[in-house]
Interface confidence: medium
């Protein structure tokens, strides 16, 4: 439905508060280096303009597209060339090329200082002094560090952030109240950002069809009682929402997400019995709740899939007449019966089925050719099952930190060219699969583990894409979205890798390590471990374990010493020498 003024339409739909917040997020995700004050000024100018269009939709420039209005505004930033270099060239382009250009310059790993949390009293004072600015600053800082963060969901995080400060800044023990809430928001926020990054990568690198297939599988697992046509409707609408958000169209995205939540709640009887509680909540909570809702119970007595998809004489006819709808039905039927499978496994099965039909429907005897197609699924199902079983056993034996270390060694040997910070970050996250998923019963382990690993490996892919250094990573990341994890799992030690020169500086530590949090200290040790493997890729587990145990003992000893710095200097030299000897460096 066309509106005379798109900006007026969105302002009225979303309301001033959400409009301003979403424009701020959009601008911060595009111009990630711009100071907060500059963004606030731009947002205020856009908001004032939007208000004139609400008053008179025929006013000058009100008929312009949002991309044109926002792009024109971003291109007024005086320091664009100095701060962003070639991104400034985007401003010479016309829409829609200009917006595409801005999107291509989004940086998944911007060179921004780590966010340091001030003292609780300092934060509470800032919150009370100017609540609006305090919350805007939160949106800005998260958005610029996570340029693909799902904007309507960030509004939900900001609402919870505000609630935490409102409650805790008047509590007797402010820190005890606030800090766990902020930790939870930080961890959930990182997870949310990574999940959305995979959705955007799926759409942008593999296309709408890939995203829709993912959505059919996931929604069919979640809503197994819904008809195929209903699932298809939800998939179409959800694809539009995510296409918009990933494309920087945050106002449209938030508006359409609200419409989708409204539709789902109005039609919950034909979608899922689990939606009742979600649908009683306010908008932001409602949308979040629907996105996280548990799987509904499977309908009783679902018939065998073989009848329609293997035994029927009409398989090739149905496939030929509407390939994507027939394959969609197959995926829907398989997924609603298998909440115990990961989405990526379901997509592999659908791909195998499609490949078989492509081949067999052109054969002399199609039915004879595809009669055993379901047998081809067995090894595909067993591979992730076995992998998860083995890794959960390893996790239970080692605990999270040592399990992460095992993965660090494994992945550094597979792709030693990747930067050390990326290997540490990705392997630590891969290692978290243990505590996240291994506690679940068998029926929930695979969807938890393999779909989580897809999200983490996508982090590796987007970070590697910025500065590609490994053909093996590029190959696993680009060949097939659903086979990324099996591709990485199948990589062996890279025999072509020339070991890194030994640099004593890499293994020189100072007393500042003693004041670090446990997490930061782990990262320091894991960074050293990666560097060790890069120097000695053929080192055995036993050799590496011995060196790491010595290293842990060295840190513990020096942190207890009276003269810590001297201890680190003298004992550090001995440790480096002993490690070189142990590893034959």
């Amino acid at each position: 439905d066309a509106h005379k003024s798109e900006v007026a339409h969105r302002f009225k739909d979303l309301g001033e508060e959400n409009f301003k917040a979403l424009v701020l997020i959009a601008f911060a995700q595009y111009l990630q280096q711009c100071p907060f004050e500059d963004h606030v000024k731009l947002v205020n100018e856009v908001t004032e303009f939007a208000k004139t269009c609400v008053a008179d939709e025929s006013a000058e420039n009100c008929d312009k597209s949002l991309h044109t209005l926002f792009g024109d505004k971003l291109c007024t930033v005086a320091t664009l060339r100095e701060t962003y270099g070639e991104m400034a060239d985007c401003c010479a382009k016309q829409e829609p090329e200009r917006n595409e250009c801005f999107l291509q310059h989004k940086d998944d790993n911007p060179n921004l200082p780590r966010l340091v949390r001030p003292e609780v009293d300092v934060m509470c004072t800032a919150f009370h002094d100017n609540e609006e600015t305090f919350l805007k600053k939160y949106l800005y800082e998260i958005a610029r560090r996570h340029p693909y963060f799902y904007a309507p969901e960030l509004l939900f995080f900001a609402k919870r952030y505000k609630a935490a400060f409102t409650e805790c800044c008047q509590a007797a023990d402010k820190a005890a109240c606030l800090l766990p809430k902020l930790d939870e928001l930080r961890d959930e926020g990182k997870a949310s950002s990574a999940k959305q990054r995979l959705k955007c990568a799926s759409l942008q690198k593999f296309g709408e069809r890939a995203f829709k297939a993912w959505a059919v599988a996931r929604l069919s697992q979640r809503f197994p009682k819904a008809e195929f046509a209903e699932v298809s409707k939800l998939v179409t609408d959800l694809t539009k929402v995510h296409t918009e958000c990933c494309h920087g169209d945050l106002l449209e995205c938030a508006d359409d997400r609200a419409d989708l939540a409204k539709y789902i709640c109005e039609n919950q009887d034909s979608i899922s019995s689990k939606l009742k509680e979600c649908c009683e909540k306010p908008l932001l909570e409602k949308s979040h709740c629907i996105a996280e809702v548990e799987n509904d119970e499977m309908p009783a007595d679902l018939p065998s899939l073989a009848a329609d998809f293997v035994e029927s004489k009409d398989v090739c006819k149905n496939y030929a007449e509407a390939k994507d709808v027939f394959l969609g039905m197959f995926l829907y039927e398989y997924a609603r019966r298998h909440p115990d499978y990961s989405v990526v496994l379901l997509l592999r099965l659908a791909k195998t089925y499609e490949t078989t039909l492509e081949k067999c429907c052109a054969a002399a005897d199609p039915h004879e050719c595809y009669a055993k197609v379901f047998d081809e699924f067995k090894p595909l199902v067993e591979e992730p099952q076995n992998l998860i079983k083995q890794n959960c056993e390893l996790f239970e034996q080692l605990g999270e930190y040592k399990f992460q270390n095992a993965l660090l060694v494994r992945y550094t040997k597979k792709v030693p060219q990747v930067s050390t910070p990326t290997l540490v970050e990705v392997s630590r996250n891969l290692g978290k699969v243990g505590s996240k998923c291994c506690k679940h019963p068998e029926a929930k382990r695979m969807p938890c583990a393999e779909d989580y690993l897809s999200v983490v490996l996508n982090q590796l892919c987007v970070l590697h894409e910025k500065t590609p250094v490994s053909d093996r990573v590029t190959k696993c990341c680009t060949e097939s979205l659903v086979n990324r994890r099996p591709c990485f799992s199948a990589l062996e030690v890279d025999e072509t890798y020339v070991p890194k020169e030994f640099n004593a500086e890499t293994f020189t530590f100072h007393a500042d390590i003693c004041t670090l949090s446990e997490k930061e200290r782990q990262i320091k040790k894991q960074t050293a471990l990666v560097e060790l493997v890069k120097h000695k890729p053929k080192a055995t587990k036993e050799q590496l374990k011995a060196v790491m145990d010595d290293f842990a003992a060295f840190v513990e000893k020096c942190c207890k010493a009276d003269d810590k710095e001297t201890c680190f200097a003298e004992e550090g030299k001995k440790l480096v020498a002993a490690s070189q000897a142990a590893l034959g460096l």
Partner: nanobody, 119 residues
Framework: EVQLLESGGGLVQPGGSLRLSCAAS????????MLWVRQAPGKGLEWVSV????????YYADSVKGRFTISRDNSKNTLYLQMNSLRAEDTALYYC????????????WGQGTLVQVSS
């Protein structure tokens, strides 16, 4: 009792247009996805197009994409199929049906309306 009554068929020249209608009763039309299927003389059933209960999304068989448009008016309990650029191979008996709950079986059928494309 469920009833589906198709109309609008007839004889038309290649390149011409027709609009088929299907009046529904006996079930809650506005919560049912609907489709058009056709059966050419001596051939099996071929599904043509599906429409969700809300009007979007819609799906089309590759053979009719870009030429046919499915639509519905829930206030009138009526399903439509606008057929443009008709070809000889579109000659068939056209049925409207309630979309299957999940599998490939169609729940309810009409009696059909004949479309003949010939010069």
């Amino acid at each position: 009792e469920v009833q589906l009554l198709e109309s609008g068929g007839g004889l038309v020249q290649p390149g011409g247009s027709l609009r088929l209608s299907c009046a529904a009763s006996g079930f809650t039309f506005d919560t049912s996805s609907m489709l058009w299927v056709r059966q050419a003389p001596g051939k099996g059933l071929e599904w043509v197009s599906v429409i969700h209960q809300s009007g979007t999304p819609t799906y089309y068989a590759d053979s009719v994409k870009g030429r046919f448009t499915i639509s519905r008016d829930n206030s009138k309990n009526t399903l439509y199929l606008q057929m443009n650029s008709l070809r000889a191979e579109d000659t068939a008996l056209y049925y409207c049906a309630k979309f299957p709950s999940s599998r490939m079986k169609f729940d309810y059928w009409g009696q059909g309306t004949l479309v003949q494309v010939s010069s």
